[in-house]
Interface confidence: low
């Protein structure tokens, strides 16, 4: 349905508050270095313009596309060239190339200071003084650090952020009320950002077909009672929503997401019995709830898959007539029967099935050729099952911190060229799979673990893409989206790696480590561990454990000393010497 003025249409659909918030997010995700005040000014100008178009859709420039309007506005920033360098060249291009250019310059790891949380009283004062500015600042700071954050979901986070301050700033113990809520929002926010980053990478690097396949599998697990036609419709709509958000079309994305939530709730009888509670909530909560809803129960009387996909004489006919529809149906039927499989495993099975049909349907006796196709699935299913079993046993034995350390060593040996901060961040996140998934019963472990690992390995892939240093990482990241995890799992120690020169400075510590939080202290120690492995890739587990135990004792001792700095200087030298001796450096 064409509208005379797209900007007026979206303003009316979304309302002024959401319109302004989404434009701010869009601008902050594009121009990640611009000061808050500059963005607010641009947003206010766009909003005023939108209002003139609402009043008269035929007014000058109201017929322009949102990309044209927003791009023109971004290109008015005076400091574009000195702040962003070659991104300024985007402004010489015409739409749609200009928007594509802006998208290519989004930075997954922008050089921005870490967000430091002020004292609770300071935050509450700022919140009461100017609530609107306080909340806008939250949107701005998250959006510029997470340029692919799912914009409508960020509105939901902001709503919860506001609710936390509204409640806690009048509580007797403000800190006890507020800090756990902010920690929860921070952790959930990071997880949400990483999940969305994988969706965008899937669309941008592997195309719409890959995303749709993922969506068919996931929605079929979640809504096993829904018919294939219903799942297909939801997949089409969901793909449109995520394509828009990943493409920077945040107003359209938020609008279409609201429409999809409305459709799902109006048709919940033919989708899932689990949606009732979600559908009673207000819009932002409703959309979030639907996205997280538990899997519905599987229909009781599902027939064997073999009848339609192996035994039927029409397999090749059906496949030839509508390949993607037939494969989609296979994926749907397999996924709805297997909520215990990860989505990536289901996609591997579908790929194996497709490859078999491609080969067999051209053979002299197709049925004879594909009759045993389901046997080929067995090793594909067993590989992640065994891996998860082994790693959960290791996690239960070691606990999260030491499990992370085991992964740090494992991954540093696999890809030692990757930067230390990236290895620490990714391995810490990989290690969280233990506490996140190993507590689940067998039937829920694989979807929890392997699909979470896909999200974390995508972080490695996008960070590595910015400054590629390892052919092995590039290969695992680009060859197959669904085989990334098996690809990394299969990597052995990189025998071509030339160990890093020993640098005592890397292992010099100061008294400031004593005032760090437990998490930050862990990161310091894990950074040292990665550096050790880079210096001595052939070091055994026992050698590394001995050095790390000594290091922990050294930190503990010096943090208790009266003259901490002297202790760190003197004991540090001894530790370095002892470590070099222990590792044969």
């Amino acid at each position: 349905d064409a509208h005379k003025s797209e900007v007026a249409h979206r303003f009316k659909d979304l309302g002024e508050e959401n319109f302004k918030a989404l434009v701010l997010i869009a601008f902050a995700q594009y121009l990640q270095q611009c000061p808050f005040e500059d963005h607010v000014k641009l947003v206010n100008e766009v909003t005023e313009f939108a209002k003139t178009c609402v009043a008269d859709e035929s007014a000058e420039n109201c017929d322009k596309s949102l990309h044209t309007l927003f791009g023109d506005k971004l290109c008015t920033v005076a400091t574009l060239r000195e702040t962003y360098g070659e991104m300024a060249d985007c402004c010489a291009k015409q739409e749609p190339e200009r928007n594509e250019c802006f998208l290519q310059h989004k930075d997954d790891n922008p050089n921005l200071p870490r967000l430091v949380r002020p004292e609770v009283d300071v935050m509450c004062t700022a919140f009461h003084d100017n609530e609107e500015t306080f909340l806008k600042k939250y949107l701005y700071e998250i959006a510029r650090r997470h340029p692919y954050f799912y914009a409508p979901e960020l509105l939901f986070f902001a709503k919860r952020y506001k609710a936390a301050f509204t409640e806690c700033c009048q509580a007797a113990d403000k800190a006890a009320c507020l800090l756990p809520k902010l920690d929860e929002l921070r952790d959930e926010g990071k997880a949400s950002s990483a999940k969305q980053r994988l969706k965008c990478a899937s669309l941008q690097k592997f195309g719409e077909r890959a995303f749709k396949a993922w969506a068919v599998a996931r929605l079929s697990q979640r809504f096993p009672k829904a018919e294939f036609a219903e799942v297909s419709k939801l997949v089409t709509d969901l793909t449109k929503v995520h394509t828009e958000c990943c493409h920077g079309d945040l107003l359209e994305c938020a609008d279409d997401r609201a429409d999809l939530a409305k459709y799902i709730c109006e048709n919940q009888d033919s989708i899932s019995s689990k949606l009732k509670e979600c559908c009673e909530k207000p819009l932002l909560e409703k959309s979030h709830c639907i996205a997280e809803v538990e899997n519905d129960e599987m229909p009781a009387d599902l027939p064997s898959l073999a009848a339609d996909f192996v035994e039927s004489k029409d397999v090749c006919k059906n496949y030839a007539e509508a390949k993607d529809v037939f494969l989609g149906m296979f994926l749907y039927e397999y996924a709805r029967r297997h909520p215990d499989y990860s989505v990536v495993l289901l996609l591997r099975l579908a790929k194996t099935y497709e490859t078999t049909l491609e080969k067999c349907c051209a053979a002299a006796d197709p049925h004879e050729c594909y009759a045993k196709v389901f046997d080929e699935f067995k090793p594909l299913v067993e590989e992640p099952q065994n891996l998860i079993k082994q790693n959960c046993e290791l996690f239960e034995q070691l606990g999260e911190y030491k499990f992370q350390n085991a992964l740090l060593v494992r991954y540093t040996k696999k890809v030692p060229q990757v930067s230390t901060p990236t290895l620490v961040e990714v391995s810490r996140n990989l290690g969280k799979v233990g506490s996140k998934c190993c507590k689940h019963p067998e039937a829920k472990r694989m979807p929890c673990a392997e699909d979470y690992l896909s999200v974390v390995l995508n972080q490695l892939c996008v960070l590595h893409e910015k400054t590629p240093v390892s052919d092995r990482v590039t290969k695992c990241c680009t060859e197959s989206l669904v085989n990334r995890r098996p690809c990394f799992s299969a990597l052995e120690v990189d025998e071509t790696y030339v160990p890093k020169e020993f640098n005592a400075e890397t292992f010099t510590f100061h008294a400031d480590i004593c005032t760090l939080s437990e998490k930050e202290r862990q990161i310091k120690k894990q950074t040292a561990l990665v550096e050790l492995v880079k210096h001595k890739p052939k070091a055994t587990k026992e050698q590394l454990k001995a050095v790390m135990d000594d290091f922990a004792a050294f930190v503990e001792k010096c943090c208790k000393a009266d003259d901490k700095e002297t202790c760190f200087a003197e004991e540090g030298k001894k530790l370095v010497a002892a470590s070099q001796a222990a590792l044969g450096l």
């Epitope: 009888d269 007539e321 509508a322 529809v325 037939f326 149906m329």
Partner: nanobody, 123 residues
Framework: DVQLVESGGGVVQAGGSLRLSCAAS????????MGWFRQAPGKERERVVS????????YYADSVKGRFTISRDNAENTVYLQMNSLKPEDTATYYC????????????????WGQGTLVTVSS
């Protein structure tokens, strides 16, 4: 052998109504999506409306939205097409079709076809 038998066609005045039926045999009816297509003389066959296996999802061509309604009775192995506010341009042979793997409702997804029933709308 699979059979789809259409009935209910005929001549009707513009603005009038007709109800077409399609009785299916030889297939597990509830496992198939059903559709109605039509072909006017000298024109290509076009999709009119389709309904998914359980009846929870339907597709209507823009030209018939609000006027035609598809429904199915899985117990009776029958699909119905209620046509109201008929127009002369609705004149065509109407075909019933069954699809095992139906996603978008395009013609190539349908496995079995009926012989057709003629609908003539006079002005």
């Amino acid at each position: 052998d699979v059979q789809l038998v259409e009935s209910g066609g005929g001549v009707v005045q513009a603005g009038g109504s007709l109800r077409l039926s399609c009785a299916a045999s030889g297939l597990t009816f509830s496992s198939y999506a059903m559709g109605w297509f039509r072909q006017a003389p000298g024109k290509e066959r076009e999709r009119v409306v389709s309904i998914s296996r359980g009846g929870g999802y339907t597709y209507y061509a823009d030209s018939v939205k609000g006027r035609f309604t598809i429904s199915r009775d899985n117990a009776e192995n029958t699909v119905y097409l209620q046509m109201n506010s008929l127009k002369p341009e609705d004149t065509a042979t109407y075909y019933c079709a069954a699809a095992r793997y139906w996603a978008t409702g395009s013609e190539y997804e349908f496995d079995y076809w009926g012989q057709g029933t003629l609908v003539t709308v006079s002005s």
